[in-house]
């Protein structure tokens, strides 16, 4: 799998899309996980509704949402109020029981907000009770990693 880079601005929302073959993955729930290290496990962040029919319903875990267009074959993940610690390697997955197929590898890059001169201590973090259904999603910039590019910095 090639890795696709999605860039977002700190404090704004980033939308990640993962296209897939809707017939191949018919009936399968999807998930978004974060890769822990270059060869480490992929830790589940959020998954689609337990009922595949309701996969279009947005599900949240903290500031991360997932929704699946099962007929069109597009999984969409929204990272709300993007922070530097959100940067890293992720995967979109199709779930088969305890197994998972990788639909796309994603490298999230967080760019500093050029208009934001506040201290990090002033950054707003969403409260649990706040709804993001009407959150404004900024256009995300994406590209594929070139051959030879490494998504993780080399370890000494």
């Amino acid at each position: 799998h090639n890795t696709t880079v999605f860039q977002g601005v700190a404090g704004q929302s980033l939308q990640v899309s993962c296209p897939y073959d809707s017939m191949k993955h018919w009936g399968r729930r999807k998930a978004w996980c974060r890769q822990l290290g270059e060869k480490g496990p992929c830790q589940r962040v959020v998954s689609t509704h337990n009922l595949w029919l309701l996969s279009f319903l947005r599900r949240w875990n903290g500031s991360t949402a997932i929704t699946d267009d099962t007929l069109g074959g597009t999984l969409t993940i929204t990272l709300r109020n993007l922070q530097p610690h959100d940067a890293g390697l992720y995967q979109c997955q199709s779930l088969h029981g305890s197994e998972a197929d990788t639909l796309r590898k994603v490298l999230v890059e967080v760019l500093a907000d050029p208009l934001d001169h506040r201290d990090a201590g002033d950054l707003w973090f969403p409260g649990e009770s706040e709804s993001f259904e009407d959150a404004h999603v900024e256009h995300s910039i994406s590209r594929s990693l070139l051959e030879g590019e490494i998504p993780f910095p080399p370890t000494s």
Epitope: D21, K24, W26, G27, W52, L53, H96, G97, E99
Partner: antibody
């Protein structure tokens, strides 16, 4: 009519190679998984593996991994099951079957081939 | 892998009687991915039930499926002569998509 038509019965000797086929018609062959199932004489059904002809993604049962190869040629809507070196214990009926898509995301092998009898004997 | 265990191995009943077949999974299976098949001697299997409880096209309503998690049941409300056959359950949840060992429904 949606159907899967399998190749004819085979009689082989131990150590020989074999490739049996399963041709789909009446539907979009590339958008349904095709599975292979073994039934030894007088025994139950055993799931061998499955292939998605659209991109040839293949899954095997651990019991059959390395023993058989599942492939597909989407240009002629045909899936294959092959052995490089047959054993007497490969004697069985082999079925191909389509994994159907149902509303609500349900799955089930809804169309079956007629079966191919493979006899391996010296 | 998920092991599917069917019971009883053989069920001896008379036409008109009710048949209850059990299928137990070694770990939880989503009901969306549980199917039942019928096989008669010399024939390919035929899909009866998908999604644990949905009848496939052309299957009479005397066949019904139920259950969730690890325990599933196929019920034939009134056995007809053509129902005497072998029945298999299968899970499509997690590869390998295993079958149960089968239950033979025979005439008493």
């Amino acid at each position: 009519e949606v159907q899967l038509v399998q190749s004819g019965a085979e009689v082989k000797k131990p150590g020989e190679s074999l490739k049996i086929s399963c041709k789909g018609s009446g539907y979009s062959f590339t958008t349904y998984w095709i599975g292979w199932v073994r039934q030894m004489p007088g025994k139950g059904l055993e799931w061998m593996g499955i292939i998605y002809p659209g991109d040839s993604d293949t899954r095997y049962s651990p019991s059959f991994q390395g023993q058989v190869t599942i492939s597909a040629d989407k240009s002629i809507s045909t899936a294959y099951l092959q052995w490089s070196s047959l054993k007497a214990s490969d004697t069985a009926m082999y079925y191909c079957a389509r994994a159907g898509h149902y509303d609500g995301g349900h799955l089930g092998m809804d169309v079956w081939g007629q079966g191919t009898t493979v006899t391996v004997s010296s | 892998e998920i092991v599917m265990t069917q019971s009883p191995g053989t069920l001896s009943l008379s036409p008109g009687e009710r048949a209850t077949l059990s299928c137990r999974a070694s770990q939880s299976v989503s009901s969306s991915y549980l199917a039942w098949y019928q096989q008669k001697p010399g024939q390919a299997p035929r899909l009866l039930i998908y999604g644990a409880s949905n009848r496939a096209t052309g299957i009479p309503d005397r066949f019904s499926g139920s259950g969730s998690g690890t325990d599933f049941t196929l019920t034939i409300s009134r056995l007809e002569p053509e129902d005497f056959a072998v029945y298999y359950c299968q899970q499509d949840d997690s590869a390998p998509y295993t079958f149960g060992g089968g239950t033979k429904v025979e005439i008493k």
